[in-house]
Interface confidence: medium
């Protein structure tokens, strides 16, 4: 599923991401935009042999199990394919674990490069939340 901007903002808010660990909803929507272009089925392969999955491009080396990433930790204890569902529950729950890990949203390279320090509230402007 490819979410609309406001549709995703509403879903993320419903799942408790607004101000989760101090990150406003705009940060999460911005991260999703630049990680996956709001596409729940996005997959991207990395040079270390891992793959990023889903709307928040969660990595198989650390967070989920895709059965083929050497040394996978699977810290979210889920199959990576669950992160590709049109229901973002699994991605959100795993993202909450990631953002609580110590580096906050710096874990997402796209957030660090494209969202951090910008007017992230623009990503939820005009949305009925």
């Amino acid at each position: 599923k490819v979410f609309g901007r406001c549709e995703l903002a509403a879903a993320m808010k419903r799942h408790g991401l607004d101000n989760y660990r101090g990150y406003s909803l705009g940060n999460w929507v911005c991260a999703a935009k630049f990680e996956s272009n709001f596409n729940t089925q996005a997959t991207n392969r990395n040079t270390d042999g891992s793959t990023d999955y889903g709307i928040l491009q969660i990595n198989s080396r650390w967070w989920c199990n895709d059965g083929r990433t050497p040394g996978s930790r699977n810290l979210c204890n889920i199959p990576c394919s669950a992160l590709l569902s049109s229901d973002i529950t699994a991605s959100v729950n795993c993202a909450k674990k990631i953002v609580s890990d110590g580096n906050g949203m710096n874990a997402w390279v796209a957030w660090r490069n494209r969202c951090k320090g910008t007017d992230v509230q623009a990503w939820i402007r005009g949305c009925r939340l």
């Epitope: 089925q41 996005a42 997959t43 392969r45 040079t47 042999g49 895709d66 059965g67 083929r68 990433t69 050497p70 199959p79 990576c80 394919s81 590709l84």
Partner: antibody, heavy 115, light 107 residues
């Protein structure tokens, strides 16, 4: 137990297309990548590409882009590979395998003859 | 693409001999190298994964070693059922690639 069952041998004319199937049983089909591998005598094994059935995400070896197309039907736990514009170079045995980085589970192979 | 070069192309041995098959990668692939055996008209069978991990059900006379660019499959005291083709495969990066194979034949 995990099994991959491929469709039977095919004999096709040059220029035609063929669709090979790979039915998976014994595991959660949507969770694992299915890989496709080509084997020609004297050419060893070549990785064609892969599909994640749960999402339809696909990756192709550059060499096979435009030649192979992967699809999957999660209702029947079956992956498909279509090969188009067939030539004699496409005559080979085609295998599906479960993509665990390494390939422990293989189909029995589908022999394609183009003549 | 990562190229895998296997040597020798053919190895003629007598049952009871011990042999070593080589697989060399064109760049470092850590331990992401797997070995397969294939007999005529059969699918490949995974023998060893990640350089040295023997798969369940594979006889202990098979062993794998190496890391980086140089890998070896060893068979201690070859048995008649071991004759066939041996391939290496890397899973360090895409596209996945295979070596050209080593044919193990009876002398």
């Amino acid at each position: 137990q995990v099994q991959l069952q491929e469709s039977g041998a095919e004999v096709m004319k040059p220029g035609a297309s063929v669709k090979i199937s790979c039915k998976a049983t014994g595991y959660t089909f949507t969770t694992y990548w299915i890989e496709w591998v080509k084997q020609r005598p004297g050419h060893g094994l070549e990785w064609i590409g892969e599909i994640l059935p749960g999402s339809g995400s696909t990756y192709y070896n550059e060499k096979f882009k435009g030649k192979a197309t992967f699809t999957a039907d999660t209702s029947s736990n079956t992956a498909y590979m279509q090969l188009s514009s067939l030539t004699s170079e496409d005559s080979a045995v085609y295998y599906c395998a479960r993509g665990d980085g390494n390939y422990y589970y293989w189909g029995q192979g589908t022999t394609l003859t183009v003549s | 693409d990562i190229e895998l070069t296997q040597s020798p192309a053919t190895l003629s041995v007598t049952p009871g001999d011990s042999v070593s098959l080589s697989c060399r990668a064109s760049q470092s692939i850590s331990n992401n190298l797997h070995w397969y055996q294939q007999k005529s008209h059969e699918s490949p069978r995974l023998l060893i994964k990640y350089g040295s991990q023997l798969m369940s059900g594979i006889p202990s006379r098979f062993s794998g070693s190496g890391s980086g660019t140089d890998f070896t499959l060893s068979i201690n005291s070859v048995e008649t059922e071991d004759f066939g083709m041996y391939f290496c495969q890397q899973s360090n990066s895409w596209p996945r690639t295979f070596g050209g194979g080593t044919k193990l034949e009876i002398k």
